[in-house]
């Protein structure tokens, strides 16, 4: 008896649906009381099908009311573990165990990633040196580095601080200044760039007509 | 309340058998993954075999692959362990454990354990 | 699978805070946070302390803590009191789904 994983890594986005496979041999019709399908994730338990059902009650609580396991594709000899709006907690080794007459056990790696595209941006300028002060903040995963360029494609150097975020997901919250003497309508790009993917996300940021004044920190009268 | 009662411990020579059982109560035992761990006398605890729910899946550690056949009785809330060609490093109290629901490792209740003595 | 290492013994008087160590891999303690405390008294079963690195089943003390950094994992026992004399054993899931546990550290309670 031997089961086959077509795939043995899944790269998927958070917030995403994944669904990975594991094949069993099936002679003519399935016997579902005789099917035993056990999904897990390293040390939780993911889901327990026996005796033709899902057993919920071992389920492990990171995993509730988002995975499942098809039942019209057991009968054609797939355990398909589907997991809807995964998380960056979701990524690890999954293992499915089949037994069915005989039993067998695959692994499967489940990688998330988060993309950085939503960049919010702010342009503010110092009146005492007319220095302005571009920022770029987005949230990913996983580090991305933030590279400043000017309209001819210079590159510029800025100032990164990463910091996890604080939302239960923990991504990412990289956030970039750059400092620089501009004028009105000057253009400059912010992309942040995860170096392992190659993957980048790019903001533009126009210098405006009015200066935007820059609150001082501890002013003193 | 959980309660796993092992029996069958003894002496016996090497090369001899021994069947383990481990009597469970207070908990759906068919819903827990189960297993066995020993401790060698003044030594640390060796995870020996786990066993899934259904009975059909099972592990065991490579000391005793081949030598040691972990099973179970849904129906009678009973868990086993036959153990084969034993040697005198199979001495160990042996604990019948129970897995944590949820995860696959983690053990939240044991056995009082029972003695198995090989020796000639 | 190697076990993983913890110091033979540890000692502190009733009222202080004593560390015991849990070193693994880069292949256990280090890859997941799933490492356990198990408390043994002499002749007895051992109990669950801590799970999943610093979670504490209901009914075990808020004395007992765990943490993990790296490839090292830690139980902190603070307030030492008598009844916390005994055998501490550490337990990592390892990436073959089976247990590997710890050497074993005595702890002792002085006075």
């Known amino acids: 008896f031997t089961i086959t994983a077509p795939k043995d890594l899944y790269v998927v986005e958070y917030g995403s649906n994944v669904t990975m496979e594991c094949r069993f041999p099936v002679e003519q019709k399935l016997d579902l009381l005789a099917l035993v399908v056990y999904w897990e994730k390293e040390d939780k338990e993911v889901i327990q099908f026996v005796e033709g059902e899902e057993d919920l009650k071992p389920q492990h609580s990171s995993f509730r009311g988002r995975a499942f396991l098809p039942k019209d594709q057991l009968l054609k000899g797939n355990a398909v573990l589907q997991i809807t709006d995964v998380k960056l907690q979701d990524a690890g080794v999954y293992c499915c165990m089949i037994s069915y007459g005989g039993a067998d056990y695959k692994r499967i790696t489940l990688k998330v990633n988060a993309p950085y595209r939503k960049i919010n941006q702010r342009i503010s300028m110092d009146p005492a040196t007319s220095e302005h002060e571009l920022m770029c903040q987005a949230e990913g995963y996983p580090e991305a580095e933030v590279i400043w360029t000017n309209s001819d494609h210079q590159s510029l150097s800025g100032e990164t601080t990463v910091t996890t975020s604080q939302t239960e997901e923990k991504l990412l919250n990289v956030t970039s200044v750059l400092r620089v003497n501009a004028t009105a309508n000057d253009v400059f790009h912010c992309t942040f760039w995860r170096v392992h993917s190659g993957e980048n996300h790019t903001a533009e940021l126009i210098i405006p007509e009015l200066p935007v004044p820059r609150l001082p920190h501890n002013r003193t009268h | 309340e959980v309660q796993l009662l092992e029996s069958g411990g003894g002496l016996v020579q090497p090369g001899g058998s021994l069947r383990l059982s481990c009597a469970a109560s207070?908990?759906?035992?068919?819903?827990?993954?189960m297993v066995w761990v020993r401790q060698a006398p003044g030594k640390g605890l060796e995870w020996v075999s786990s066993i899934y729910p259904s009975g059909g899946i099972t592990f065991y550690a490579d000391s005793v692959k081949g030598r040691f056949t972990i099973s179970r009785d849904n129906s009678k809330n009973t868990l086993y362990l036959q153990m084969n060609s034993l040697r005198a490093e199979d001495t160990a109290i042996y604990y019948c454990?129970?897995?944590?629901?949820?995860?696959?490792?983690?053990?939240?209740?044991w056995g009082q354990g029972t003695l198995v003595t090989v020796s000639s | 699978q190697s076990a993983l290492t913890q110091p033979a013994s540890v000692s502190g008087s009733p009222g202080q805070s004593i560390t015991i160590s849990c070193t693994g891999t880069s292949s256990d303690v280090g890859a997941y946070n799933y490492v356990s405390w198990y408390q043994q008294h002499p002749g007895k079963a051992p109990k669950l302390m801590i799970y999943?690195?610093?979670n504490r089943p209901s009914g075990v003390s808020n004395r007992f803590s765990g943490s993990k950094s790296g490839n090292t994992a830690s139980l902190t026992i603070s307030g030492l009191q008598a009844e916390d004399e005994a055998d501490y054993y550490c337990?990592?899931?390892?990436?073959?789904?089976?247990?590997?546990f710890g050497t074993g550290t005595k702890v002792t309670v002085l006075g």
């Open positions: 337990s990592s899931y390892t990436s073959s789904s089976t247990r590997v």
């Open positions: 207070g908990f759906t035992f068919s819903s827990y993954l």
């Open positions: 999943d690195v610093s």
């Open positions: 454990a129970r897995i944590k629901l949820g995860t696959v490792t983690t053990v939240d209740y």
